[in-house]
């Protein structure tokens, strides 16, 4: 004869377990049902009556089989630097990712806390290490012999023209004027782009040019506290 | 203990003026890349400005260019946050950061040193 199907709630055997998707009540001592995603359980199971589950209210989820009393609140909405990569259902919580230009400066367990724009090389200074979706560009002065002129977060310092006779030296912020009509260059003319996983910052957050400062020696800090808890008002 | 303060928040009338300061302690400020965030309320934090201190070059949101203004007094190990001609929508809670600047193998680049914050508010 077939096994005898127990429908919940129901008494597991000594030392055995409950269903798949099916959670064990300590208080009724028997083995009762989940809720499915997008609901909660509203009223607990019993001896003798299973889970009662309820659908999340507008701005808050449950994204796996559960018997949670309250539907998880879903984060804040995004800010203006981020993108709405999934947005907030009773399934699943909103995810905010980084709009071009800019990288994630501050993460959460999905998407981002905070985008900060990408940094952008003023002239006399090139991208020693370009930006990722979690790194900022690192800038350095440009080297005797290369220059950059650009306000980029993708050019490198690039050499000199090399010059038969040399009208105007160069200098970090200015390639060496020729007054040879045919100079030679080490490499291809033009702004030099380091491959770059985000595209460049957008304009409005071009630097304001202040005096330059000799870098100073970098000091490593252990991470501190966390910033204010993320609000979950929702929307 | 590497901490920063923030402080000077406070219920200021449309068109008023505050100044934030944040002040580094346990770690020197010299070396590092300064920025504020704000949260608003309900909404996410939104980077507002930043100040990279091998250059000392600043950059600004775009809500609050001409109006805010960030700077450092390295003597005083603080960074400040000039507010001007505030709106409502620059109500929220305002923090500071700091980080190294581009990070290193040891400690990749993220916001290292994170503040409290302190709470603005922008009514009539």
């Known amino acids: 004869l077939p096994a005898q199907v127990a429908f919940t709630p129901y008494a597991p055997e000594p030392g055995g377990t409950c269903r798949l998707r099916e959670y064990y009540d300590q208080t009724a001592q028997m083995c009762c049902s989940k809720c499915p995603p997008g609901q909660h359980a509203k009223v607990f199971c019993t001896k003798t009556s299973d889970t009662v589950c309820d659908s999340c209210e507008d701005s808050t989820y449950t994204q796996l089989w559960n018997w949670v009393p309250e539907c998880l609140s879903c984060g804040s909405r995004c800010s203006s630097d981020q993108v709405e990569t999934q947005a907030c259902t009773r399934e699943q919580n909103r995810i905010c990712t980084c709009r071009p230009g800019w990288y994630c400066a501050l993460t959460k367990q999905e998407g981002c806390r905070l985008c900060a724009p990408l940094r952008k090389c003023r002239p006399g200074f090139g991208v020693a290490r370009p930006g990722t979706e979690t790194s900022d560009v690192v800038c350095k002065p440009c080297a005797p012999g290369t220059f950059s002129n650009t306000t980029s977060s993708t050019d490198i310092c690039r050499p000199h023209q090399i010059c038969n006779v040399v009208a105007v030296p160069g200098n970090a912020s200015m390639d060496a004027v020729c007054t040879s009509t045919s100079p030679t260059r080490s490499m291809a003319p033009g702004p030099v782009h380091l491959p770059q996983p985000v595209s460049t910052r957008s304009q409005h957050t071009q630097p304001t040019p202040a005096p330059s400062t000799a870098p100073g020696t970098s000091f490593l800090l252990p991470v501190g506290p966390s910033p204010p808890a993320e609000g979950s008002t929702g929307d | 203990d590497v901490q920063l303060v923030e402080s000077g928040g406070g219920l200021v009338h449309p068109g008023g003026s505050l100044r934030l300061s944040c002040a580094a302690s346990g770690f020197t400020f010299s070396a590092d890349d300064a920025t504020w965030a704000r949260q608003p309320p309900g909404k996410g934090l939104e980077w507002i400005s930043t100040?990279?201190?091998?250059?000392?070059?600043?950059t600004y949101a775009d809500s609050v260019k001409g109006r805010f203004i960030i700077s450092r007094d390295i003597a005083k190990n603080t960074v400040y946050l000039q507010m001007n001609n505030l709106k409502p929508e620059d109500t929220g809670m305002y923090v500071c950061?700091?980080?190294?600047?581009?990070?290193?193998?040891?400690?990749?680049?993220?916001?290292?040193?994170w503040g409290q914050g302190t709470q603005v508010t922008v009514s009539s």
């Open positions: 100040l990279y201190f091998d250059t000392e070059e600043k």
């Open positions: 950061t700091a980080t190294w600047a581009g990070g290193s193998l040891l400690r990749p680049a993220s916001f290292g040193v």
